[in-house]
Every structure is written in C-alpha cells, then in structure tokens.
C-alpha cells in the first residue's frame, strides 16, 4: 500500500570502483525522505543512510566486510514528517536494486605507473598497487593483495618516434621488456581481470614516456 | 495525554545484558518512530538509537552497534533496547522519546530509567 | 558526524535580563531544497526530561513562552531568552536532526546571578 503522498525510487544502480561503491537512485525527495538497507543473500538487512534526503548511499563500509558475497539492497521511500500527520501508517514502499557482487563487478580503477628504469636494452615499468578500502586485520589491501592473480596489467609500449604499439603482460605490477637502444619509448598500462564476464578492463593510465621525470635512465 | 513511562533499568555487572522497555500510550503508537537516548551521570545527551514506525529500520550510534538492538511490539504499544555485553560507560539514564514533527525532533519523553554499570 | 559546540557552557544572567546562547554545526544543516534548518533546541530542567522549545531553528513548539526565540542559519545558530524568568533557570541543548547520527550540543547551564 505504502505511505501518503510517497514514491517508490527507481533506477537503483551501483557505481563502484575498486571496491568505493555507491548505490544511486531516483528521484530526488519531495516530500520524502529515504532509508537504504543492504543485505548479503543469507544475512539480515541493515539500515544504511537513515532518514537521508540524498539520493546516493555509500555502502563501501558494507561489501568490504566480505567482496565475494552477493548483496542486495532496498530503498524505502517514508513522508517527510511525522506518520501521523502525514495519512496512512501501511507498509512503506521500497524497491530492489540488482544484486552486487563486488568481486565480480567493482571497476578497475585507472591505473598509474609509478616509475620506469632502463638499463642497458631493458626496461622495468612498476604499475602502482593501488590502495582498497577493504580491510585486513586492521590495514588496507591492495588491489594485488585483493584480487592476486586474477589481476594482470597489460602494457602498451611504442617509440616515441612512431605508433606502432606493441603489448606485453604480466600477472604481478611489474614489465621487464626489451627496448631498441639510444630510442626513447611511451608507455600506459591497463588492469585487466581476464576471468570476469563484466567490467573485465580498467581506462587506460596516463601515458608516460621516457626522458620524463618518472624514468630513470642506467648506461651499462 | 501521551505519556511514555520507561522500566527495566538497574545495577548490573560489565559483560551482562539489561532489556529496557518503554510503555506508550495517548498517541498512535504505530504511526510514530521512536528512539532511544541516554545521558550519563551530569554529563550532556547522546543518541542512541532509533526504529521507524514500521519496525522495518533501525540505526544506532557506533559506541553501541552490536551491543544494543532496538525493537518494538506495535500491538503492545511498547518500544524496547536490549543492551548485551553492558561497559561502565553505558552508565546513564536511558530516555525513550517519539518523533515529532520531524524525524528526531522529540516532542515527548519518558521520565528514564537509570542503568548502572558497576562490578 | 555532525560535531555540535554550545557556548558558553556557563550563563549567569539578571531576572529580566537578556541570555543568549550559541551552537555551531561542524557542517551545515540547512537543506537547500526547503530552505529549513534542522536544528532543535531543548531545556532540561534538574531530574527531567529535556523539553522541546524549538525546531527548524526558530519555529517554537506549542506552548512554549515566547520569551524563548531562534535564529541562525547553516552553521551558526542562537537562542535567545527575551527576558530571563526564575523557572528558566537549567541547562539548554541544541540538536541537530539534519543526518544521522543524530547529535547533541554540549549544553549551556543558565542560572541567574
């Protein structure tokens, strides 16, 4: 039956990236206010965003507890006001978002290299271990730490006097590859999670190219 | 008139459990949320929980989440908080008080009940 | 959290006089889409229960004196009591009921000097 005067939300969609995930909805109160709850497929519900007149509730602090669970979540659409003041006391209305599993569906974020060095005809590119908001006893993992090597990065690298790319792969966060000599190289990494159905592939990192300060140049 | 008239408080030991109840009447109790608040010995006051008219929602402070769990009996009139694993610093008198004209605004609370956390 | 500071903490004031408390938001609780503070203040009186005065930081609630008045906006509100009475004498708590969890200020003892 629902409340007076109250709608039921709709176009409940997740936005996460490495595991900062936020569920949004429409539309925006009037009138009305809104709880969220979050819920593994097994687990009790939990009230999130209490009485919250925003449309967007962050439930990173819920899925990180456990990233391979399916969650689901709800949105309850109350009067803005007492109950009793506003009509009917029935059932509140809410509406289902699609289940999420963040192990599964979480973007990759875009990645940085941190640094390359070249010595002699080699050179190693360090891809940066970003940073989760998923926690281990008391510290936060990385994304290496999270998704081990179900995580690989592909490279792309070409002269800087040319566009032919070519790729290389690696299942940890560094690329040891070999390079012409005296010639100055680009590079920009991608995550890749290549067992995944969905959101399989991060944005490209911005590109860095040697003789820039990232690098760091060895005659041998 | 409406009134709310707390009970269950009491002297009890660190790590034990306490249920406070909290009688309504004079109002539709099922059309009103209603929250928990407690005020520790001459100190200020401090949220502590809240349930929607509904029962469906509830939201607590963290200083008791996993502790404490607040419930209702909409066909009893009666609001309850069920305090396990009880600290000294839970010492204090717990107020049950109903939303007013908005949610978290109280109109109306209960007189207290004094909980005591000693050894 | 929203973090609430009341001062002063202390207030001796004259019968008849003038007092004036003050309450600051960590964030602001005015919502834009309504243009309404949601901000309440209480007295609680020794062995009492507190008891609303006002909400939406200036609508007084129903039989409250009018002595008793609100204003502020966003982040700096105040209360003031016109003319100080012998029964006004206790503490005064500001709460905002903007997001949760909801929050209290520390109080303002007023007593007359």
């Known amino acids: 039956s629902g409340t007076t005067n109250t709608v039921a939300a709709y176009n409940l969609t997740w936005k996460s990236t490495n595991f900062k995930t936020i569920l949004e909805w429409e539309p925006k109160p009037v009138n009305q206010v809104y709880t969220v709850q979050i819920s593994t497929k097994s687990g009790d519900w939990k009230s999130k965003c209490f009485y919250t007149t925003d449309t967007e509730c962050d439930l990173t602090d819920e899925i990180v507890k456990d990233v391979k669970q399916t969650y689901l979540a709800r949105v309850f659409s109350y009067p803005a006001g007492n109950v009793e003041s506003t009509g009917s006391a029935g059932e509140p209305l809410y509406e289902n978002s699609p289940e999420f599993t963040p192990y599964l569906e979480t973007n990759l974020g875009q990645p940085t290299i941190q640094s390359f060095e070249q010595v002699g005809t080699k050179v190693n590119v360090t891809v940066e271990d970003e940073r989760t908001l998923v926690r281990r006893n008391n510290t936060f993992l990385s994304l290496r730490d999270v998704f081990g090597k179900d995580l690989i990065y592909t490279l792309y690298y070409w002269k800087s006097s040319s566009s032919g790319k070519k790729t290389a792969k690696t299942n940890t966060n560094e690329f040891l590859i070999d390079v012409d000599k005296g010639e100055n190289y680009c590079f920009s990494v991608q995550a890749v999670i290549p067992s995944r159905t969905v959101n399989r592939k991060s944005t490209d990192s911005p590109v860095e190219c040697m003789g820039q300060e990232k690098g760091e140049f060895r005659e041998i | 008139q409406v009134q709310l008239v707390e009970s269950g408080g009491g002297v009890v030991q660190p790590g034990r459990s306490l249920r406070l109840s909290c009688a309504a009447s004079?109002?539709?109790?099922?059309?009103?949320?209603m929250h928990w608040v407690r005020q520790a010995p001459g100190k200020g006051l401090e949220w502590v929980a809240v349930i929607t008219y509904d029962g469906i929602n509830k939201y607590y402070a963290d200083s008791v989440e996993g502790r404490f769990t607040i419930s209702r009996d909409n066909s009893k009139n009666t609001l309850y908080l069920q305090m396990n694993s009880l600290r000294a610093e839970d010492t204090a008198v717990y107020y049950c008080?109903?939303?007013?004209?908005?949610?978290?605004?109280?109109?109306?609370w209960g007189q207290g009940t004094l909980v005591t956390v000693s050894s | 959290d929203i973090v609430m500071t009341q001062s002063p903490d202390s207030l001796a004031v004259s019968l008849g006089e003038r007092a004036t408390i003050n309450c600051k938001s960590s964030q602001s609780v005015l919502f834009s889409s309504n243009n309404k503070n949601y901000l309440a203040w209480y007295q609680q009186k020794p062995g009492q229960p507190p008891k609303l005065l006002i909400y939406w930081a200036s609508t007084r609630e129903s039989g409250v004196p009018d002595r008793f008045s609100g204003s502020g906006s966003g982040t700096d509100f105040t209360l003031t009591i016109s003319s100080l009475q012998a029964e006004d004498v206790a503490v005064y708590y500001c709460?905002?009921?903007?997001?949760?969890?909801?929050?209290f200020g520390g109080g303002t003892k007023v007593e007359i000097k």
């Open positions: 008080a109903r939303d007013g004209v908005y949610y978290g605004v109280y109109d109306y």
């Open positions: 709460q905002q009921f903007h997001s949760y969890p909801l929050t």
């Open positions: 004079g109002f539709t109790f099922h059309s009103r949320g």
